[in-house]
């Protein structure tokens, strides 16, 4: 029977993924009930991607190395759809670092997994980034102009932001 | 908590091969994918070749291409690099490292993507 195998391949996954995220939050995608997409709860899902607040404040190397042993990275965002999403999830008085950086001091802006930087889809504050010296970017609340990026120095601990692709069982 | 362990380095002449091994331990090794990066003396660390954790899917850096391979043994818990017409400008200490991934088919390639880092294995090519 075609669904009593792909329901024991199921549970087989889950229970392989389970030391990793001990609960998974699946949803059927489209009519098919083959495809569940899942994100480990109490991540929030967006589109193809799952998403993490991190309240423990660490530097930026210490919060990737956080997201990448949960087999996330710190966020890259790619649409303004995308940061209205995250924002949803942030608390105004608080900043959190995002998964781009500048380590050689030029402004030479990487995205951690290595996505193209694109000028055109950014969201910096008005006048950042403004300092060489801080190379690591996060996104916090100014009530003039809401919620936008602004680059700081990396070893400063702040809130985090992970972001993982669904996991398709 | 993974651990791992390269091996297979050494010196060898310009145009010779090696294949480099990463032995890994500690968890579920299909779990993972795997990534080679390597560190000249004063240069910085840059990655070389990766592979998805299902072994379907590789990338390497554009100096490498053609030359070396990037394989899995998901069974032996153990990755490899085949390193095929060596140049002198490939003399550098070699790492393997692992990341956690529920992705079948995503090879990555960035160094900070990768938590789990071996101690290295030196390769030295003369000319």
């Known amino acids: 029977n075609f669904m009593y195998s792909k329901t024991v391949k199921r549970l087989s996954k889950l229970r392989e993924y389970q030391q990793y995220h001990p609960s998974l939050t699946c949803v059927m995608e489209g009519k098919d009930i083959e495809d569940w997409s899942c994100c480990p709860t109490p991540w929030t899902s967006f589109q193809s991607s799952c998403y993490f607040i991190s309240t423990g404040m660490q530097s930026w190397t210490k919060s990737q190395k956080n997201c990448s042993v949960m087999g996330a990275d710190l966020v890259v965002i790619n649409t303004r759809e995308e940061q209205d999403f995250i924002i949803q999830n942030l608390k105004r008085n608080s900043s959190y670092f995002l998964g781009l950086s500048d380590p050689g001091g030029r402004r030479h802006w990487q995205w951690v997994d290595q996505t193209p930087y694109n000028e055109n889809v950014t969201f910096w504050h008005s006048g950042e980034p403004n300092n060489l010296d801080e190379r690591c970017a996060i996104i916090n609340f100014r009530s003039s102009e809401e919620w936008g990026w602004n680059d700081i120095h990396c070893h400063v601990p702040q809130k985090s932001i992970c972001k993982m692709k669904k996991i398709y069982i | 908590q993974v651990q791992l362990q390269e091996s297979g380095g050494g010196l060898v002449q310009a145009g010779d091969s090696l294949r480099l091994s990463c032995a890994a331990s500690g968890d579920t090794f299909s779990m993972y994918a795997m990534g080679w990066f390597r560190q000249a003396p004063g240069k910085e660390r840059e990655f070389v070749a990766a592979i998805s954790r299902s072994g379907g899917s590789t990338d390497y850096r554009d100096s490498v291409k053609g030359r070396f391979t990037i394989s899995r043994d998901n069974d032996l818990n153990a990755g490899y690099l085949q390193m095929n017409s060596l140049k002198p400008e490939d003399t550098a200490v070699y790492y393997c490292?692992?990341?956690?991934?529920?992705?079948?088919?995503?090879?990555?390639?960035?160094?900070?993507?990768?938590?789990?880092w071996g101690q290295g294995t030196q390769v030295t090519v003369s000319s």
């Open positions: 490292a692992l990341r956690l991934t529920f992705s079948t088919t995503t090879a990555y390639t960035g160094e900070l993507q990768y938590p789990y």
